[in-house]
């Protein structure tokens, strides 16, 4: 009679993570008598996957009833496959021996490859806010996918970005892979409502890519523009001066009025109005009693926005020696304004 052969008909098997892998194996003869064992790997370090005789193999079931005397089908199923199960599996026939069974013949091996979905992409932006016209970097990471081939794209408000670098690790063979990409984005004043999207496409996703997003509202700082104006006189000796703080983001803002360099009042932006682009406007006013001043008054609106160095705008009020002769509308005069940083 011809010597027993161990047939593993499948050179390779591809299984999605979470599914069950079927590893096929048949023997061509019932002789010699002895058990079948399944191993992962062929060397001395090979791992025991299933032993017909004894052992605990909770994830493994046999395809046919191995207790039947004429059974020659030694195929197994391995449940709940993960990328860590990848490797080459061998069906090995042992000959009954004393005290130990002796390895008789091995199948050619079946390589199990695992398809695993990438994790949801996580997009992270810079640690500190940046102002318009600056370039900032965003990173996108996704892990645990197999096979290695993967496509990553970046978008800003639906427009594809081209300035990015992507790495897939490791370079060599592995049970699963990770992707890391860094994109450069130039900020504009209109980006408060903008979104950066990282899109990952992989064979396991069946054409439905995964997306990770970052809101530029977490990244951008739009500094305010200031305008100080003098309102018509409310009473003969009072002038109303307003400071318009426009187009700023985020809302965190503190304003200080200075009269001739001395602090007059400090307030925090509260009742702001929101612009269509997501930036904010705010207005503060100061009532100046002109009669209390013998000389000209320099009014300064000083704004500290989001912890940045203060920005200010000044306005000069001329105090006339003969206010009655000027008329009620000219009790104070705007003689120009300037914007400066105070460090």
């Amino acid at each position: 009679e011809e010597e027993l052969q161990v047939i593993q008909p499948d050179k390779s098997v591809l299984v999605a993570a979470g599914e069950t892998a079927t590893l096929r194996c048949t023997a061509t003869s019932l002789i010699p008598v002895g058990p079948i064992q399944w191993f992962r790997g062929a060397g001395p370090g090979r791992e025991l996957i299933y032993n017909q005789k004894e052992g605990h193999f909770p994830r493994v079931t046999t395809v046919s009833d191995l207790t039947k005397r004429n059974n020659m089908d030694f195929s197994i199923r391995i449940g709940n496959i993960t990328p860590a199960d990848a490797g080459t599996y061998y069906c090995v026939k042992f000959r009954k021996g004393s005290p130990d069974d002796v390895e008789f013949k091995s199948g050619a091996g079946t390589e199990l490859s695992v398809r695993a979905k990438p994790s949801a992409p996580v997009v992270s932006g810079p640690a500190a806010r940046a102002t318009p016209q600056h370039t900032v970097s965003f990173t996108c990471e996704s892990h645990g996918f197999s096979p290695r081939d993967i496509t990553l794209k970046w978008f800003k408000n639906g427009n594809e970005l081209s300035d990015f670098q992507t790495n897939v690790d490791p370079v060599g063979e592995s049970v699963s892979y990770s992707i890391h990409s860094t994109a450069k984005v130039v900020l504009t004043r209109e980006d408060v409502h903008s979104q950066v999207i990282c899109e990952v496409a992989h064979v396991t996703l069946q054409g439905d890519p995964l997306r990770g997003t970052a809101n530029l509202s977490e990244t951008i700082r739009v500094p305010p523009t200031l305008e100080v104006t003098q309102q018509p006189v409310r009473a003969e000796n009072q002038v109303n001066v307003t400071c318009q703080v426009r187009k700023f983001y985020p809302q965190r803002l503190q304003l200080t009025w200075l009269e001739n360099g001395n602090v007059s009042r400090t307030e925090t932006a509260s009742t702001v109005t929101e612009n269509k682009d997501g930036t904010y406007n705010w207005m503060s006013w100061l009532l100046v009693n002109v009669s209390a001043h013998r000389d000209d008054v320099k009014l300064t609106c000083q704004v500290e926005h989001d912890g940045q160095p203060a920005v200010s705008k000044s306005h000069d009020l001329k105090v006339s020696a003969h206010p009655k002769e000027q008329g009620s509308n000219t009790a104070a005069e705007n003689t120009g304004s300037n914007e400066r940083n105070i460090y």
């Epitope: 060397g43 370090g45 791992e47 605990h56 063979e173």
Partner: antibody
Framework: DVQLVESGGGVVRPGESLRLSCAAS????????MTWVRQAPGKGPEWVSL???????YYADSVKGRFTISRDNSKSTLYLQMNSLRAEDTAVYYC???????????WGLGTLVTVSS | EIVLTQSPGTLSLSPGERATLSCRAS??????LAWYQQKPGQAPRLLIY???SRASGIPDRFSGSGSGTDFTLTISSLQSEDSAVYYC??????????FGGGTKVEIK
């Protein structure tokens, strides 16, 4: 969690014997090959011996005929019987679990064997 | 028996710097080369296998490359906790499994 705890080390004279044990937990011991690796003071690791899942044994040339590796799957314990010890056997002896592709993925903390006259 | 030669013997670098460790095999091992990290008083810990695959839980500042006989372990930005001895090991051939002599990485 995988844990490997070695015991049995100590100080012996040249020519004497010692038996090391390694108690394993946190994985199905019988399904994996196990190995002993030693490290002499200030030197790199040196592979000593391996026992496969089918109880086949392998040895480094430097210990062949003097050391015997064995396993007791019912106790999840690995052993190394060391006979005819020499000064050059002085080292920390680690037991390690081997993966199917010959990686030493988990190691014990080691047990010190000193052979000195 | 495959002999693994590591260089340099010692590498002294500052935190944040890039460390490049080399391992050369006396004959080809394909991509079957692993790297281990050993800190004083501890057992070696598997870092990299199959030349470039990171073991479970290993930070991505550790990366491996190479095939055949020449291999490199790179630590992209050294941290104080990376101070250790690093060993390469071939897992291509059957016993004996051989290790390199090690490279000591010191943080200035």
């Amino acid at each position: 969690d995988v844990q490997l705890v070695e015991s049995g080390g100590g100080v012996v004279r040249p020519g004497e014997s010692l038996r090391l044990s390694c108690a394993a937990s946190g994985f199905t011991f019988s399904n994996f090959a196990m190995t002993w690796v030693r490290q002499a003071p200030g030197k790199g690791p040196e592979w000593v011996s391996l026992v496969s899942v089918t109880a086949t044994t392998y040895y480094a040339d430097s210990v062949k005929g003097r050391f015997t590796i064995s396993r007791d799957n019912s106790k999840s314990t690995l052993y190394l019987q060391m006979n005819s010890l020499r000064a050059e056997d002085t080292a920390v002896y680690y037991c390690a679990k081997i993966t199917w592709n010959n990686l030493f993925d988990y190691w014990g903390l080691g047990t010190l064997v000193t052979v000195s006259s | 028996e495959i002999v693994l030669t590591q260089s340099p013997g010692t590498l002294s670098l500052s935190p944040g710097e890039r460390a490049t460790l080399s391992c050369r095999a006396s004959q080809t091992v394909g991509s079957k080369l692993a790297w281990y990290q050993q800190k004083p008083g501890q057992a070696p810990r598997l870092l990299i296998y199959d030349s470039s695959s990171r073991a479970s839980g290993i930070p991505d500042r550790f990366s491996g490359s190479g095939s055949g006989t020449d291999f490199t372990l790179t630590i992209s930005s050294l941290q104080s906790e990376d101070s250790a001895v690093y060993y390469c090991q071939q897992h291509n051939d059957w016993p004996p499994y051989t290790f390199g002599g090690g490279t000591k990485v010191e943080i200035k």
